[in-house]
């Protein structure tokens, strides 16, 4: 999915009112330091294709993320926001609930939550200039 | 645990320049923008601009534009801030601030630099 | 720029009691706001972040409320260590902008 036609202020908005709480809630008992960010991006909509790639798709580890209220309320933004993005999830949907796992919070989806909170961290500032 | 130690006081002549540093420590430099506020009595806190330290990228206030500039050195984790052609109104207190771990607000201030200028 | 107006400079409370510190926005600043102590001679200290959220270490009789544009800081249980300046900054666009500033004290 382009992310280029989301309403990236709304995301935003719903990011620092509502995500932001749960992945506070999920990283509760975790240090800020304790991981360092592997992943990055460039601009917002690059960021929100990370952002989906590290929520939603299931890594060695961690395969439970999608279930969590962070994730349900990321793809209610993505599906409001971003025209068209609920139509090219049905499938990814479907696919989810055929491999659906208990709930197991490891120090592998700490750490992957710890990804997300520097992409939506950098997706949140308003746009840089380089120097 | 999160440190952001800054420069000491400065004294300097008007239309001198200065640069002003802040270390951190205890985290990622380069996964935390960096802000510089400015303080005084008559305008309070007042918001200088910031810096990614990643990619080198700003944003200043329209105040503070071709007064202040940002850099930040990814080998020494260290921020500074350069301020030109200084006269008493850039007398103040200057902080360092940490973005914050889930953006949309700062957390760790520095401990400040004190700048007077005068002749 | 969005202009946060801290109408109250001066605000004058006892230990024990509850006082609320207010912060109005020019506009829409939506929930990224934040409070921000400053005792006498020191830095600030982050309080509270996003509008309602505690920042690590800070005592639970601080509480923050509010989204849009009408934000507020509950000190319940006044400690005559809270006499200090308090200031509101929004997060919402480039530049930042603090609040005036209100300083609190003990009667």
């Known amino acids: 999915y382009d992310f280029t036609n989301c309403d990236f202020e709304k995301i935003k908005a719903a990011y620092l009112s509502t995500i932001s709480k749960d992945l506070i809630t999920y990283m509760s008992g975790t240090k800020s330091t304790e991981f360092n960010n592997t992943v990055s991006c460039s601009n917002r909509p690059h960021c929100l294709t990370e952002i989906q790639s590290l929520t939603f798709n299931p890594t060695a580890g961690c395969a439970s993320l999608a279930k969590e209220m962070f994730a349900m309320k990321t793809k209610a933004a993505l599906a409001i926001w971003c025209p068209g993005y609920s139509e090219t999830q049905i499938n990814a949907t479907q696919a989810m609930k055929k491999r659906r796992k208990r709930k197991v919070t490891t120090n592998k989806c700490l750490e992957q939550v710890s990804q997300l909170q520097g992409l939506w961290r950098r997706f949140n500032r308003p746009l840089l200039k380089q120097q | 645990q999160v440190q952001l130690q800054q420069s000491g006081a400065e004294l300097v002549r008007p239309g001198a320049s200065v640069k002003l540093s802040c270390k951190a420590s205890?985290?990622?430099?380069?996964?935390?923008?960096m802000h510089w506020v400015k303080q005084t009595p008559v305008h309070g806190l007042e918001w200088i601009g910031t810096?990614?330290?990643?990619?080198?990228?700003?944003a200043y206030t329209q105040k503070f534009k071709g007064k202040a500039t940002l850099t930040a050195d990814i080998s020494s984790n260290t921020a500074y801030v350069e301020l030109r052609s200084l006269t008493s109104e850039d007398s103040a207190v200057y902080y360092c601030?940490?973005?914050?771990?889930?953006?949309?607000?700062?957390?760790?201030w520095g401990q400040g630099t004190t700048l007077s200028v005068s002749s | 720029d969005i202009v946060m107006t801290q109408s109250q400079k001066f605000m004058s409370t006892s230990v024990g009691d509850r006082v609320s510190i207010t912060c109005k926005a020019s506009?829409?600043?939506?929930?990224?706001v934040a409070w921000y102590q400053q005792k006498p001679g020191q830095s600030p200290k982050t309080l509270i972040f996003?509008?309602?959220n505690r920042h690590t270490g800070v005592p639970d009789r601080f509480t923050g409320s509010g989204s849009g544009t009408d934000f507020t800081l509950t000190i319940s249980n006044v400690q005559s260590e809270d006499l200090a300046d308090y200031f509101c900054?929004?997060?919402?666009?480039?530049?930042?902008?603090f609040g005036g500033g209100t300083k609190l004290e003990i009667k």
């Open positions: 601030t940490r973005e914050g771990s889930y953006g949309g607000y700062v957390d760790y």
């Open positions: 506009q829409n600043v939506h929930t990224a």
């Open positions: 900054l929004q997060l919402w666009n480039y530049p930042y902008t």
């Open positions: 810096i990614d330290p990643e990619t080198g990228g700003t």
């Open positions: 996003l509008a309602s």
């Open positions: 205890g985290y990622m430099f380069t996964d935390y923008a």
